[in-house]
Amino acid sequence: VPEKSVRWCAVSEHEATKCQSFRDHMKSVLPSNGPSVACVKKASHLDCIRAIAANEADAVTLDAGLVYDAYLAPNNLKPVVAEFYGSKEDPQTFYYAVAVVKKDSDFQMNQLRGRKSCHTGLGRSAGWNIPIGLLYCDLPEPRKPLEKAVANFFSGSCVPCADGTDFPQLCQLCPGCGCSTLNQYFSYSGAFKCLKDGAGDVAFVKHSTIFENLANKADRDQYELLCLDNTRKSVDEYKDCHLARVPSHTVVARSVGGKEDLIWELLNQAQEHFGKDKSKEFQLFSSPHGKDLLFKDSAHGFLKVPPRMDAKMYLGYEYITAIRNLREGTCPEAPTDECKPVKWCALSHHERLKCDEWSVNSAGKIECESAETTEDCIAKIMNGEADAMSLDGGFVYIAGMCGLVPVLAENYNTPNPNCENTAEEGYFAVAVVKSSSDLTWDNLKGKKSCHTAVGRTAGWNIPMGLLYSKINHCRFDEFFSEGCAPGSEKNSSLCKLCMGPSPNLCEPNNKEGYYGYTGAFRCLVEKGDVAFVKHQTVPQNTGGKNPDAWAKNLKEEDYELLCLDGSRKSVQEPANCHLARAPNHAVVARKDKADCVQTLLLDQQRMFGSSVTDCSSNFCLFESKTKDLLFRDDTVCLAKLHDRNTYEKYLGEEYVKAVTNLRKCSTSPLLEACTF
């Protein structure tokens, strides 16, 4: 097979015919050295998935449920291109499965037992698989057959296409459970009508259903959405209140050697030549031979799925949970209102050791999961492999964009006992230089810079945001002659100054000696001209406070701060000489785990927090000899957020705006994936 060929998998005679037409028309518009199409015919989508895994084919377009099958071992396929619907300006690649109720009713998601339910149809995503999958562990046992368990959970339902003879309760609201539009409560509009007519108490539909059926906002305002955290929101807030986000139709390929760039090149060219309203002789998104062949007829085009986005992230935690529950039929033995152990995400082996020690001391209430970078940890929390971690504000922003929520803030200045309930204002991001140098904020060009890591607040977002507004471009590696900014491209001048050791050189974790606040300061001491750190860094590492060989003889007076007005001040004067105020680090978690994480951490800090005085023979949560492992070492306590419980509210408008501006320069693959 020529390496430029994409072997498309077709699942019927009609699809194979369209595939051949696709192949021939692409040949006529693409250069001979461009991508080409070959067609492989299989009996089913599952056979196509197996064929791609076995390298007998390269690509196929699948519905969400099949993307899940494709992702499971041993297939290990991943999404590479998404169909989009709607306009090019506002492309929709996902829809949201929602639970709609009337505003004048008074129950929540966890009070659905005994209510009347309206469904789009048996086995359908938004109307059955997702809601029933998520409710699965609340269904009465035995849970098989599933229809019987659902019939016993709700007091009456309309589930079009269900067997009304065996499960009459599922057809109580629509006698016969008709499987076509002859049943007035069939499909999306029908399920909504079932709610609207007062037959049912809740309708499981997609987010657009209510807008398609009620053009008038005043009418829509009579309805609300049930959220998974047992609150309600208005129908326009579906992005923050849904049962799951469901990808519409997706091209999948092998995770390794999957030709994803070639597939994108092919489909991008195909949509240019044969997309909506492009050509009379061949149309990608329709066919005289049948409906939805190879691609959905309703699709308007294709979007490349960001490379960081694997199937778990693409399908989303809620969707995977629902489908896994339905498929595997397993439920935790503990009641769902009881907190399971919290899986903490640790960065590399240094944090992992501290986490293990915490795990032992917590008697297993804390478990540990590891990742090599902060972004990998955030991804693990998103997909349920981990539950929580403490993050610098820059990563709180990324985590927030990825759907995680802040749970508790690290406090650095408030003494106990008021600490837990105090909202601190934040710390100062500063630029530190050697007293002996003649540097100012205005003559940093061509100098050697030391950063905590790319994407972090004091070390990157604040100084580079200020720099960007001055130089109006993102080529920071050209502005400084060299530097160490862990997380930069390995061949960048901003990795040149890093310490390593070798395989870990410039990695954004503790294996890189110049990582983090202490590492950036060490970089200044040993090699650099300026370090971007927090205002406490110099005092914490001078005057013998850090016993490491490189730091033990350092004096505070040998370092000064750069002020934005071009002057310099003593490190004792950060309030009058800083780059900006930075939000404190904060613990983040998935919404569904936030309460458990908060309860457990408040309990853990009472045992292992700053009230422990002897850390040489006792476990201390906020101590790691200046390494800031798991938490910053200067943390006094973890504090409640009260109403600052979203990333925007926590970080504040000014900081969010600054980071959003800097997104033009973003090198965050995770942020790209989460904003897809």
């Epitope: 501290k354 008697a363 023979s617 006792n618 390494k627 492992l629």
Partner: nanobody, 117 residues
């Protein structure tokens, strides 16, 4: 700094038992948490079991109910009693005292445990 020496490993059949010992050159009484780790070829080192000074214990899910960790502060020794051994328990077992404070890689030699018929 306390030096630790692991012993007691060996070749054992599936279902068999072994008792590993970890002897400290100094007093472990003042050390809060002691733990056993293991590393199988090509795999990451993982926590097997840990014990605090007050006797709180914690075990990896895969060994719960089969392994028991204990410590004798008077003898400056930590033990790992391993029952119902399985082939997947094959690894080098290391003892650590966490007083190294998380960022030095000075692990001991370890003791090899091989479970095979």
């Amino acid at each position: 700094q306390v030096q630790l020496v692991e012993s007691g490993g060996g070749l054992v059949q599936p279902g068999g038992s072994l008792r590993l010992s970890c002897a400290a050159s100094g007093s472990i009484f003042s050390i809060n948490t002691m733990a056993w780790y293991r590393q199988a070829p090509g795999k990451q080192r993982e926590l097997v079991a840990g014990i605090t000074r007050s006797g709180t214990t914690n075990y990896a899910g895969s060994v719960k109910g089969r392994f028991t960790i204990s410590r004798d502060n008077a003898k400056n020794t930590v033990y790992l009693q391993m029952n119902g051994l399985k082939p997947e328990d094959t690894a080098v077992y290391y003892c650590t005292d966490y007083s190294r404070r998380y960022y030095q890689d000075d692990w001991g030699q370890g003791t090899q445990v091989t479970v095979s018929s």
